[in-house]
Amino acid sequence: GPVWRKHYITYRINNYTPDMNREDVDYAIRKAFQVWSNVTPLKFSKINTGMADILVVFARGAHGDFHAFDGKGGILAHAFGPGSGIGGDAHFDEDEFWTTHSGGTNLFLTAVHEIGHSLGLGHSSDPKAVMFPTYKYVDINTFRLSADDIRGIQSLYGDPKENQRLPNPDNSEPALCDPNLSFDAVTTVGNKIFFFKDRFFWLKVSERPKTSVNLISSLWPTLPSGIEAAYEIEARNQVFLFKDDKYWLISNLRPEPNYPKSIHSFGFPNFVKKIDAAVFNPRFYRTYFFVDNQYWRYDERRQMMDPGYPKLITKNFQGIGPKIDAVFYSKNKYYYFFQGSNQFEYDFLLQRITKTLKSNSWFGC
């Protein structure tokens, strides 16, 4: 069955049951997610606006899917397996009486079960498992996943130690002057340069030595961490940000509504699942998209891919490749390509590398 192909997952509580205080609902849902993050590398964060991976909904009767609720008792809730759109969403029957305790239906216990489905688990035949199909109250203070639940979820996502393989765990700010520092994405935004890494970005105002580190979520709460590619069309005050098979449009530093959208709307074939790097060249009014060892060229005026692509990076950008992490355009004639902790200043008129630098050379390290 399907799984989330990322470790940072967002959720949003669409509406609140009147049966409980809002804070109690928030707490029950947060603790339910925590049950699963404790035994996997997954990290969950709540967002209040925009499109989350998992939408939590309280509804009664018919509510927009094929599975209308049935009044009090019977079906308490249901959740969809990982995926886009309705995928991952968890629906709770408002005709139940939701509680923080043993009376009525305990929201925390039900949510743990439904989030299991949201993460890709099916039902368990072990009566001690939270994924057993029938609801049974247990003391929430001593509640623990069964061995079967843990086995099931770790077969999909691995165990939490896998976090330690990541160069920067989610809660630590990468060291800016670490000689091994690499970036996920880099782009100009007006006279500034944004450097993205994990859930952080650094802001470099051109010609000034000072840089500041920020959480992506502090500037754009609806955007995910781990931005993988970015480019700017300065004349339109637009910045495009990419992660997995989705992209977001930022206009005048504000996220546009109705995003994210699929990267396939640019005309990529279905096998393209993510973009490594992207850069817009205002001289040609073309955007270059780098995917593995190839690149595509997109005509921003005609809003379509140029014919004859993809091409090999190594064939057309001498000394660059075979893959890159990030790239941006500067000073009317240079692309700055990032590969791991190295950076290459590339003159696109001369079509050659003119300088080799460390990736963090912009920060006076």
Partner: antibody, heavy 122, light 103 residues
């Protein structure tokens, strides 16, 4: 490449029966919900029936409940619609459509067959 | 049961025009709304799912918005191949369709 190909349509008298088939290829058939959607001549789309990946859960529009039966054979990658007690108002092009993976149906029809025409007339 | 009301039922426009079609649900369906395009004699084609997500391979001139009960499909600059019938849908309910014709 995902492909759905319907067959079994034709002319049938009111009160008669017909069995439609939909042969699927290009995806893991047993992972997906599948549906039948119909379109009467010159009219809009009408959802008819859906079936879960295992075949354990089925759903029907009120207009066909008790007369139509949806089923699937995962070993043959084929979806079926058994139509009994046919009426003139069942005349339509019948499409099979693929939905999402998982325990519940999203009603998100990302791939459709070309359709097969069923005409109920005396 | 939830009802879906689509408007207008037909619409005349010219190549290059910006066109908006609306769909209203009788009660909240959150963002669980899809849009399809159908050309004569052809099967419907998924354009937008979950109210605003563009299906793979669909041109970016198509966009969707809305949540709760009110939804819109917008075509930013009509192309000759866009003249067709458009349907909104949630679960087992389709809108009546909007026929987009050349002016």
């Amino acid at each position: 490449e995902v492909q759905l190909l319907e067959s079994g349509g034709g002319l049938v008298q009111p009160g008669g029966s017909l069995r439609l088939s939909c042969a699927a290829s290009g995806f893991t058939f047993s992972d997906y919900w599948l549906h039948w959607v119909r379109q009467a001549p010159g009219k809009g789309l009408e959802w008819v029936s859906g079936i879960s990946p295992s075949g354990g859960m089925t759903m029907y529009a009120d207009s066909v409940k008790g007369r139509f039966t949806i089923s699937r054979d995962n070993s043959k990658n084929t979806l079926y619609l058994q139509m009994n007690s046919l009426r003139a108002e069942d005349t339509a092009v019948y499409y099979c459509a693929r939905d999402i993976v998982g325990p519940y149906s999203a009603g998100l029809f990302d791939y459709w067959g070309r359709g097969t025409l069923v005409t109920v007339s005396s | 049961d939830i009802q879906m009301t689509q408007s207008p039922s037909s619409l005349s426009a010219s190549v290059g025009d910006r066109v908006t079609i609306t769909c209203r649900a009788s009660q909240s369906i959150y963002t669980y709304l899809n849009w399809y395009q159908q050309k004569p004699g052809k099967a419907p084609k998924l354009l937008i799912y979950a109210a605003s997500s563009l299906q793979s391979g669909v041109p970016s001139r198509f966009s969707g918005s809305g949540s709760g009960t009110d939804f819109t499909l917008t075509i930013s600059s009509l192309q000759p191949e866009d003249f067709a019938t458009y349907y909104c849908q949630q679960a087992g309910i389709f809108g009546q369709g909007t026929k987009l014709e050349i002016k």
